[in-house]
Interface confidence: low
Amino acid sequence: QPSVSPGEPSPPSIHPGKSDLIVRVGDEIRLLCTDPGFVKWTFEILDETNENKQNEWITEKAEATNTGKYTCTNKHGLSNSIYVFVRDPAKLFLVDRSLYGKEDNDTLVRCPLTDPEVTNYSLKGCQGKPLPKDLRFIPDPKAGIMIKSVKRAYHRLCLHCSVDQEGKSVLSEKFILKVRPAFKAVPVVSVSKASYLLREGEEFTVTCTIKDVSSSVYSTWKRENSQTKLQEKYNSWHHGDFNYERQATLTISSARVNDSGVFMCYANNTFGSANVTTTLEVVDKGFINIFPMINTTVFVNDGENVDLIVEYEAFPKPEHQQWIYMNRTFTDKWEDYPKSENESNIRYVSELHLTRLKGTEGGTYTFLVSNSDVNAAIAFNVYVNTKPEILTYDRLVNGMLQCVAAGFPEPTIDWYFCPGTEQRCSASVLPVDVQTLNSSGPPFGKLVVQSSIDSSAFKHNGTVECKAYNDVGKTSAYFNFAFKEQIHPHTLFTP
């Protein structure tokens, strides 16, 4: 019993003056609390609590359930306790069968004894099964049996409290241990799509999947740089014991341009946090942007191949593509394909393959594409470089020699005179007149050039060469010239 120091409040005194008291079932429990400032008696066992304002606690016929801690408290808040065991051979354990353990923490199997003098107070597996080898426990007759450092593997473990009574093993009712897993990693979060492109008024719906060991993981959708609470719906599943999945679906029923931005699905547990983002872009209407992959002005040599290539972005998906030349639509020689097979792809490539181009096939080649909202087009101007061709070479009635040549780029015509019958002419002759005949015509065809010289300048027999040339090549025509005789053209000769 506590000793009394005058002038200082002291705890109450209890009779009988023991810390523990053992009574038999059916006997009387009589406890007296002596204190001038007595307030109350309190009885506690498991989750049960009773109070008594009388300073003497009397239970006429004790039962096993009267086993527990009796505490007397005074007005100074000081208290004193006695633990009473009510020995009942038919009820050795008081039990609270709820048993939850947090992974890596200790948990109490609540099976306090009614008789402290029984032996071998311990835990046993149900149906004779052994307990896990690493399971350690500490018995306490007044509280139960403490399992140390609960493991995830103990989940759903069935066990009994056990004592030996008169050489026989007596088991309590069974307990099923439910283990609450500890978070040992951040949640795993994923999103249904990393980016969304929508038109105004369309529905935006995105699902975030959160996976963790238990349902106590926290998750939410947030808009970056905004505190606005977003409306989301949840579905969840337990796939086995420590495999929890939640789907958080964010929906904007009619998206607007100013809803565009980055949305973050955020999840955290006691270990840490994780997040994943998706980007929403809302456009007021669909679009098509076309980008040429080669210069839109193309020069190609006669007989060569060229590929006209465009890359384009189309949203919604392109519905109609075509390549056109001279109001004619190509049915083949072109291909159109998405740049990636990703479901959110908006980039496409179109290629027109022009083979063995002729001088007559220069012109404007146009790629057209449309979707449900817009049309777009891009034009390529194709110039076919051709070696000059001499179309005519004549002596005119006025004594002029005239040479007409066609090619692209525009040919240059030079004149040479060779004395005698040499066909290797070097002395150049200045033309009297040079004209480009069709410069006002279509810009893509061959350009025709006419050049004239005055034959009266020649005083000797010989050969006159008309040479037409450009960047691609050259062609010559020859005139045999006899002084004071008719000039007649020679067979066209191309070196």
Epitope: S195, N289, I290, F291, A376
Partner: antibody
């Protein structure tokens, strides 16, 4: 020669107004997208506003929307920026820029003026 | 809004060095990226548009690459006239510039 010349900058008190002008020459002004870009002392470039040549649509930086107005007069080959309720953070060199395009709707700024200085201070 | 982040903010290099500047967008901007050069007291000058297309009159030692969110400007052999500040700019949703990279003489 393609040229853009800005004018109208100066010192103004917070809350005051200024009107910047940009005179264009050497190209067909009405065919081009135009924009204003600014640069605070010792800082980087910041797009402020732009105007589409075909639709007349205007676009603004969030922090200037409602205070600044971009406009153009194609007959005078001129671009304007009316700046009201000026703040200290609007202090910058303001450049006028021409937008050229690649593809069908993708713009970049290929010609810039030399800039005009706006100082907002009490 | 789309944020553009340039790195490094400054670098020192010598004539003849190969210089690489990176630009990262806060969300995908496809290939809608331009690069500008600015010298002190001067207006910016367009170098590259649509990620890799060289503006007329710009020397071929300048090149650009990338797509989506990550882009690079490379100067293959730095010349004395290349010491300047370089800015990237996105054109996907309106316009925004990176913070700039100052290329200084070592």
């Amino acid at each position: 020669e393609v040229q853009l010349v800005e004018s109208g900058g100066g010192l103004v008190q917070p809350g005051g107004s200024l009107r910047l002008s940009c005179a264009a020459s050497g190209f067909t002004f009405s065919d081009y997208y135009m924009a204003w870009v600014r640069q605070a002392p010792g800082k980087g470039l910041e797009w402020v506003a732009s105007i589409n040549q075909n639709t007349g649509s205007t676009y603004y930086l969030d922090s200037v929307r409602g205070r600044f107005t971009i406009s153009r007069d194609n007959a005078k080959n001129s671009l304007y920026l009316q700046m009201n309720s000026l703040r200290a953070e609007d202090t910058a060199v303001y450049y006028c820029a021409r937008g050229d395009y690649y593809g069908t709707t993708y713009w970049y700024f290929d010609v810039w003026g030399q800039g005009t200085t706006v100082t907002v201070s009490s | 809004d789309i944020q553009m982040t340039q790195s490094p903010s400054s670098l020192s290099a010598s004539v003849g060095d190969r210089v690489t500047i990176t630009c990262r967008a806060s969300q995908s901007i496809s290939s809608y990226l331009n690069w500008y050069q600015q010298k002190p007291g001067k207006a910016p000058k367009l170098l590259i548009y649509y990620t890799s297309r060289l503006q007329s009159g710009v020397p071929s030692r300048f090149s650009g690459s990338g797509s989506g969110t990550d882009f690079t400007l490379t100067i293959s052999s730095l010349q004395p006239e290349d010491f300047a500040t370089y800015y990237c700019q996105q054109g996907r949703r309106l316009w925004s510039f990176g913070g700039g990279t100052k290329v200084e003489i070592k």
